[in-house]
């Protein structure tokens, strides 16, 4: 993942230096937040792993990376990071395993740098469509964000809404076109059954899409033609039967791609001899060497690209009121 | 509690180099930028220059280009100016000094190096 | 360069005397800060943000000021006070101090 990093071998925790006897106060008031450590020189501030319920009030102006991992926010409220003067310098900002399952609209205002967010492992049962894009305007003012990481946001089924997960995630990100600039989107370990079909195409800028170890089926509805830009398709561990003509022939024409395709339960039969044929041609595909089938029972393990033609057939299948005699 | 111990007064030849030193104690070097100052006998205060450690980076004041080079090593704690080419114009007392960046600036300053140029 | 300049460069008071010295700046800053140096000394943080006292800093200083126009008060002198004042801009490069301010006690 590409969530911002630890940036400073040693941070200067917000507890004041001791003396050998009494501690000297220091001239100048830390500007630490309390259960945070920090280090001017990265602009970096650490709150992780401190069980914060909410976002500390005091955070110094100077902050560019901001952690806030292994807390309990539970909900980010609208203008969560919203300060005076505003945090203008804030880039990366970390809220990974923070139990956060509520993250309100505008959550994310008034930070005009911010390029990276990470909101990974958090039961996100409720994501206002409104979270990253501040308003509810057709069209919002672009956000400047760059990267969005959203890997593992799936809450437990008992704490979904009565609603559909992918639909809820995808209406953040497409509300208001605010993310039109981004450029990697993590969306691994959700669940996903499908990708709605309007979603890639309004994020034109993506570089690196993310959505390995779901449970994705089929991309035939999905279009990959808009994304020019695309560099990386992370698609394994997944469901993906077959990809179908449409979709190689999309992927054929980005001119930049690397795809993954690892570990998915490809059905080797007649319906798989066209991605069979592209495999053996294509580039595009990283490790194509390991695909193996997983069905029918006969193929299973075989290499796809050690198949041919002869061996992908399809047995024909009885209408129900035929198959009992 | 936070030190900034500086290396010992120096008399040196005109033309020659120097290489002061500025070891911190009480925090760690790297999570904050350091500034130095000079200040001739009885005069004002005069900003060299500012490092960031973590990052190396630097920013003088135009005025100390080429005079002066600041560096820093994370593993000692201590940050260093390098002062070249001395003339008698160089003489003064060096400060070290933590800069705050919330602040804009210094909190603590080091005792100063007094240098004197003198054939 | 952003020039500071402190008036007077020197001046007296008598203890329990109200003692103000004013720092103008060149340029427009959001903000200055204030040093106090004692003879064979190096500096201290004195006031910063303008009005704000540094630790320890007794009670009886205080600052104020905005834009091209900053200064320091002392609400009743004493003879600790004597010592030099440096007012700093820290906000554009280079960073400036005014020429200072000694204060001596008659």
């Known amino acids: 993942s590409s969530s911002p990093t630890s940036s400073a071998s040693s941070f200067s925790s917000s507890a004041p230096f001791l003396a050998s006897a009494v501690s000297a106060q220091p001239p100048l008031p830390d500007q630490c937040p309390a259960l945070c450590e920090c280090s001017e020189a990265a602009r970096t501030v650490k709150c992780v792993n401190r069980n914060l319920t909410e976002v500390p009030t005091d955070l110094p102006a100077y902050v560019r990376n901001l952690f806030l991992t292994g807390n309990q926010l539970a909900v980010l409220p609208a203008g969560a990071f919203a300060r005076r003067p505003p945090l203008a310098e804030l880039a990366a900002l970390n809220l990974s395993g923070s139990r956060l399952d509520e993250v309100r609209a505008g959550a994310f205002e008034h930070l005009p740098s911010l390029r990276q967010l990470d909101l990974s492992h958090n039961p996100l049962a409720d994501l206002s469509p409104f979270a990253f894009s501040g308003s509810n305007a057709s069209v919002s003012a672009p956000s400047p964000l760059v990267e969005l990481i959203l890997n593992h946001i799936v809450p437990p089924e008992d704490e979904r809404q009565n609603r559909s997960f992918e639909g809820m995630v995808v209406a953040a990100l497409l509300a208001g076109r605010a993310l039109q600039g981004l450029r990697r989107l993590e969306l691994a370990s959700n669940h996903f059954l499908y990708l709605p079909r309007d979603v890639l195409a309004q994020l034109p800028s993506l570089r690196h899409l993310d959505l390995s170890n779901n449970s994705l089926v089929s991309l035939t509805y999905v279009s990959f033609r808009n994304l020019t830009h695309l560099e990386s398709l992370h698609l394994e561990d997944n469901a993906l039967k077959v990809l179908h003509n449409g979709t190689l022939a999309e992927l054929q024409g980005l001119p930049h791609i690397r795809v993954f395709l690892d570990n998915n339960p490809w059905v080797c039969d007649c319906h798989m001899a066209d991605m069979v044929t592209w495999l053996k041609e294509t580039e595009v595909v990283q490790g194509k060497d390991r695909l193996t089938c997983a069905y029918p029972e006969k193929m299973r393990n075989r290499v796809l690209l050690e198949l041919n033609s002869a061996d992908l057939d399809c047995d024909p299948i009885l209408p129900p009121s035929l198959q009992t005699s | 509690e936070v030190q900034l111990r500086q290396s010992g007064p120096v008399l040196v030849k005109p033309g020659a180099s120097l290489k002061m030193s500025c070891k911190a104690s009480?925090?760690?070097?790297?999570?904050?930028?350091m500034t130095w100052v000079t200040q001739s006998h009885g005069q004002s205060l005069d900003w060299i220059g500012l490092?960031?450690?973590?990052?190396?980076?630097?920013t003088y004041n135009q005025k100390f280009k080429g005079k002066a080079t600041l560096s820093v090593d994370k593993s000692s704690n201590t940050a260093y100016m390098d002062l070249n080419s001395l003339t008698s114009e160089d003489s003064a007392v060096y400060y070290c000094?933590?800069?705050?960046?919330?602040?804009?600036?210094?909190?603590?300053w080091g005792r100063g190096t007094s240098v004197t140029v003198s054939s | 360069e952003n020039v500071l300049t402190q008036s007077p460069a020197i001046m007296s008071a008598s203890p329990g005397e109200k003692v103000t010295m004013t720092c103008s700046a060149s340029?427009?800053?959001?903000?200055m800060h204030w040093y106090q140096q004692k003879s064979s000394t190096s500096p201290k943080v004195w006031i910063y943000?303008?009005?704000k006292l540094a630790s320890g800093v007794p009670g009886r200083f205080s600052g104020s000021g905005s834009g091209n126009s900053y200064s320091l008060t002392i609400s009743s002198m004493e003879a600790e006070d004597v010592a030099t004042y440096y007012c700093f801009q820290g906000i554009g490069y280079p960073y400036t101090f005014g020429g200072g301010t000694k204060l001596e006690i008659k």
């Open positions: 009480g925090f760690t070097i790297a999570d904050y930028y």
């Open positions: 490092i960031n450690p973590y990052s190396g980076e630097t």
């Open positions: 340029s427009s800053v959001s903000y």
């Open positions: 000094a933590r800069w705050r960046l919330g602040y804009y600036a210094m909190d603590y």
């Open positions: 943000d303008t009005s």
